[in-house]
């Protein structure tokens, strides 16, 4: 964590990225532990700011407005040296976001991966915006940063992300900022939860009271496993929206969830997966897809009696 | 101890401005932010913005932009919400709270609120 | 914006009973969430900060819970002056908006 042997570290808390209105706290640990200092902010030749203020422990800043993005540097106290001050620390980039209107972020060749593949994510615009920042919710790393690429009146980024990972998977959003405001940033994008999969063993999924059924019959999907996964995640091939539900222990020493799809009008594939609560983006191997097939007279949709989870929320637990 | 006290209530016509009042006491009213908050008849609470005493720099609600104008005079430790082109449905009971310290602080102070009855 | 969807919005409990409110956000809100309680005809007051913390002068039966998006005011032993509506609100960047409120009534 620490630089140079005078050189101390500065932090923030609990993100580098923080909203219009957020408050974040500045620490700055010289020397094994956290003494007096002082804060400037690069765009301020290097002039200690809060006039000159001098902090312990940590500083904190808020509610945050546009002017308070920037690079900040602090300094530690030292008593016996000549100035009485450390040398600067390590720059800290504080971006303050909810400045332009948000871009949009989507994934290609989709949200659902198996482990080691690639995505793209590619984050675009009508708002002209110089540069675009993609960040994973929950680290406290620094976004990627790209410039925007401008054509047809659109400004785009695309963001590699790969080979896929248990730590990459979750839920991103991306920022853009205009020329000359480089740390003010948009409001975020929607939420895109990348999902993982291919990790665990698949469960089996099965239908009651079997795959071909009459229209206007009731039909449930069970999916279950002896794995103790929590959760259970129910998709049909060529829909967009996944369902899930909770996993429940069985006398069998089983674990199984009961999709209730209700009357049956339209047939379709059908594929279950699992995972952990702990985990919630890092999904099993598929199950073995289920074909249902209607007979007599089917619609153009089924209706769905469960749920469907949104775009995101696929990496929230499930309360 | 801290204290924040509202102006009485106001009765309005439609299309009318009406200025409502919090006088702060008991602590460095430059030193905090001054929020304002609505609550309409029967219904939940709404952030309506906030006032920096020291700068003056303030920050509203998309949904009240056009509606409220913020402002405060550090030499009475007053803070001032003006709401313009008053419509019914702005008929409510307007709150300023002070917005406390730390790294999570909440409002930690409440005015006892000013009802504004915009009737013809 | 970020939104916060309270549960129950209304709530009958008698004295003496454990109620659990909760308030989901759209977002990580980094425990930057408090909870009030309104009486009829009155401002606000300040439960719970920061999540957790208990504002001062308030009864240890209330206690504050959750991180991330999901949070949760607990009322041990209700007692007759906690019937009133209780609000969550975030501070994670403006506008800070408030919860549903729910309403705690005698049964």
């Known amino acids: 964590l620490m630089g140079g042997q005078d050189k101390p570290f500065l932090s923030a808390r609990p993100s580098t990225v923080v909203p219009r209105g957020g408050h974040v706290a500045l620490q700055c640990h010289y020397r094994r532990g956290f003494n007096n200092f002082m804060l400037y902010k690069e765009d301020r030749s290097h002039v200690p700011i809060f006039h000159g203020r001098i902090f312990q422990e940590s500083f904190i800043m808020g509610p945050v407005t546009p002017a308070h993005a920037g690079t900040y540097r602090c300094r530690g106290s030292r008593p016996h040296s000549l100035t009485g001050w450390s040398a600067p620390s390590n720059p800290l980039v504080i971006m303050v976001t909810g400045n332009h209107r948000k871009p949009s972020l989507l994934a290609h060749p989709g949200p659902l991966l198996k482990s080691g593949e690639t995505v793209i994510l590619q984050c675009w615009s009508d708002v002209m915006f110089e540069h675009f920042f993609l960040h994973r919710e929950g680290i406290s790393e620094d976004p990627s940063r790209l410039v925007g690429q401008i054509h047809d009146g659109v400004s785009k980024a695309n963001f590699s992300i790969g080979p896929l990972m248990p730590v990459l998977a979750g839920t991103y959003r991306c920022y853009g900022s205009v020329p000359h405001s480089p740390y003010q940033l948009s409001a975020p994008s929607d939420p895109l939860d990348i999902v993982i999969t291919g990790l665990y063993e698949k469960p089996s999924l099965s239908a009651q009271p079997g795959p071909t059924v009459q229209a206007g019959e009731n039909v449930t999907l069970s999916c279950s496993s002896w794995s103790s996964y929590d959760i259970y995640h129910l998709s049909r091939e060529g829909e967009a929206h996944e369902r899930r539900l909770r996993a429940v222990p069985k006398v069998n020493r089983t674990f199984q969830a009961d999709f209730p799809l209700g009357p049956a009008t339209h047939g379709g594939t059908y594929r279950c997966f699992g995972s952990f609560r702990a985990l919630p983006c890092v999904w099993s191997n598929s199950s073995d897809p289920l074909l249902v097939s209607v007979t007599g007279n089917p619609s153009s949709s089924w209706p769905s009696p469960t749920e469907p989870s949104s775009k995101s929320g696929i990496c929230r637990h499930l309360h | 101890q801290v204290q924040l006290v509202q102006s009485g209530a106001e009765l309005a016509r439609p299309g009318a401005s009406v200025k409502v009042s919090c006088k702060a006491s008991?602590?460095?009213?430059?030193?905090?932010?001054m929020h304002w908050v609505r609550q309409a008849p029967g219904q939940g609470l709404e952030w309506i913005g906030y006032?920096?005493?020291?700068?003056?720099?303030?920050e509203n609600n998309r949904k009240f932009k056009d509606k409220t104008t913020l402002t405060a005079d550090k030499s009475t430790s007053t803070a001032y919400m003006e709401l313009s082109s008053l419509r019914s449905e702005d008929t409510a009971v307007y709150y300023c709270?002070?917005?406390?310290?730390?790294?999570?602080?909440?409002?930690?102070?409440w005015g006892q609120g000013t009802t504004v009855t915009v009737s013809s | 914006d970020i939104q916060m969807t309270q549960s129950p919005s209304s709530l009958s409990a008698s004295v003496g009973d454990r109620v659990t409110i909760t308030c989901r956000a759209s977002?990580?809100?980094?425990?930057?969430l408090a909870w009030y309680q309104q009486k009829q005809g009155k401002a606000p007051q300040l439960l719970v900060y920061?999540?957790?913390n208990l504002a001062d002068g308030v009864p240890s039966r209330f206690s504050g819970s959750g991180s991330g998006t999901q949070y949760t005011l607990t009322i041990n032993s209700l007692q007759p002056e906690d019937f009133a509506t209780y609000y969550c609100q975030h501070f994670w960047g403006t506008p800070y908006t408030f919860g549903g409120g729910t309403k705690l009534e005698i049964k």
């Open positions: 977002e990580n809100i980094y425990s930057n």
């Open positions: 709270a002070r917005l406390g310290k730390g790294l999570l602080p909440p409002f930690d102070y």
């Open positions: 920061a999540a957790t």
């Open positions: 008991g602590y460095t009213f430059t030193s905090y932010t």
């Open positions: 006032i920096n005493p020291s700068s003056g720099y303030t």
